[in-house]
């Protein structure tokens, strides 16, 4: 069977909005009106894995592009990036681990853990206008909420 | 240091299951990250992989296998298990465990091998 | 599938030779590549990992380069424990697969 996929934008907690900046990278910032359209848009995949209540395995990626979140170590660090790949082969229900978020909701919020790294989260700065990142605390400085907005096919 | 030793017949016949088992030392399956493959290599030929594990129990199979193969792992005992059902003589090959960590991670580690012949 | 094709499947060379192993898979794999070194009653061995990082312990004459479809293992000058059949590997997508082998003979 298919791959089952939604499409959606996400905002983080404060309301900032994710963009792309450059070909390889995503940036939060508070958009308004017109600008909004300038948000990223998801296709996120409900893919095989440990799967709970309150806790779903996805895929995220972009919207009419061949480019997914993925989350690898470098420097031995484990970082977010966007990596392309073979669109003719993607979504596939047996997404490669660096691939996978654990889509975990919580009051109404979102979290998106890395099934690769536990306790990694997508995560947002405080500041306007700064990179999408993997961040290892939640609760702290970095936000690592988020709420989804449907958007149609 | 890191080591890896796989077991298991010599000899099995054609339509029976083959349980490999892969024994190591030097790292856990319980520390995250962590995963092990199996792969093979018949006589005079190249390398194929046929399924891998990860510390959480995420399995992933070669898609023109996967319908015969199952890997377990036994964390306490420092195992990965493989089994390969209806085994036909065209398996006839040296079969090795490796560590492969956090994807896209490569095989840094690899057994020596066991040879098994597929035979009446 | 992606599929690795390597090149020469074998060659001779002589001791202090510059020998160069290429590797083309089918799709870009995004440097996801990896080399091994198979010598016969030795386990295999990683030599280079994400195209072009040298896994710890293995000598500098080893080195790997390349992008998208294109790469190649160059060992600088050759010695006599190099000679050994060689394998390139994607990690990209599963399932990984191994190129066909390169066996390097003593000419």
């Known amino acids: 069977a298919p791959v089952r996929s939604l499409n959606c934008t996400l905002r983080d907690s404060q309301q900032k909005s994710l963009v792309m900046s450059g070909p390889y990278e995503l940036k939060a910032l508070h958009l308004q009106g017109q600008d909004m359209e300038q948000q990223v848009v998801f296709s996120m995949s409900f893919v095989q894995g440990e799967e709970s209540n309150d806790k779903i395995p996805v895929a995220l990626g972009l919207k009419e592009k061949n480019l997914y979140l993925s989350c690898v170590l470098k420097d031995d660090k484990p970082t977010l990036q966007l990596e392309s790949v073979d669109p003719k082969n993607y979504p596939k229900k047996k997404m490669e681990k660096r691939f996978v978020f654990n889509k975990i909701e919580i009051n109404n919020k979102l979290e998106f853990e890395s099934a690769q790294f536990p306790n990694w989260y997508i995560s947002t700065s405080q500041a306007e206008n700064m990179p999408v990142f993997l961040g290892g605390t939640k609760g702290g400085q970095d936000i690592t909420d988020f709420t989804m907005q449907f958007v149609s096919s | 240091q890191v080591t890896l030793k796989e077991s298991g017949p010599a000899l099995v016949k054609p339509t029976q299951t083959l349980t490999l088992t892969c024994t190591f030392s030097?790292?856990?399956?319980?520390?995250?990250?962590?995963?092990v493959s199996w792969i093979r290599q018949p006589p005079g030929k190249g390398l194929e992989w046929l399924a891998h594990?990860?510390?959480?129990?995420?399995?992933y199979y070669s898609p023109s296998l996967k319908s015969r193969l199952t890997i377990t792992k036994d964390t306490s005992k420092n195992q990965v298990v493989l089994t390969m059902t209806n085994m036909d003589p065209v398996d006839t090959a040296t079969y090795y465990c490796?560590?492969?960590?956090?994807?896209?991670?490569?095989?840094?580690?690899w057994g020596q091998g066991t040879t098994v012949t597929v035979s009446s | 599938d992606i599929q690795m094709t390597q090149s020469p499947s074998s060659l001779s060379a002589s001791v202090g030779d510059r020998v160069t192993i290429t590797c083309r898979p089918s799709?870009?794999?995004?440097?996801?590549l990896n080399w091994y070194q198979q010598k016969p009653g030795k386990t295999l061995k990683l030599l280079i990992y994400?195209?072009?990082r040298l896994h710890s312990g293995v000598p500098s004459r080893f080195s790997g380069s390349g992008s998208g479809t294109d790469y190649t293992l160059t060992i600088s000058s050759l010695q006599p424990e190099d000679f050994a059949t060689y394998f390139c590997?994607?990690?990209?997508?599963?399932?990984?697969?191994f190129g066909g082998g390169t066996k390097v003979e003593i000419k």
């Open positions: 490796a560590r492969g960590s956090y994807d896209p991670s490569p095989f840094d580690y």
């Open positions: 030097g790292f856990s399956l319980s520390t995250s990250g962590m995963g």
């Open positions: 594990i990860y510390w959480d129990d995420d399995k």
């Open positions: 799709r870009d794999i995004t440097n996801y």
């Open positions: 994400h195209t072009s």
């Open positions: 590997q994607q990690s990209k997508s599963v399932p990984w697969t």
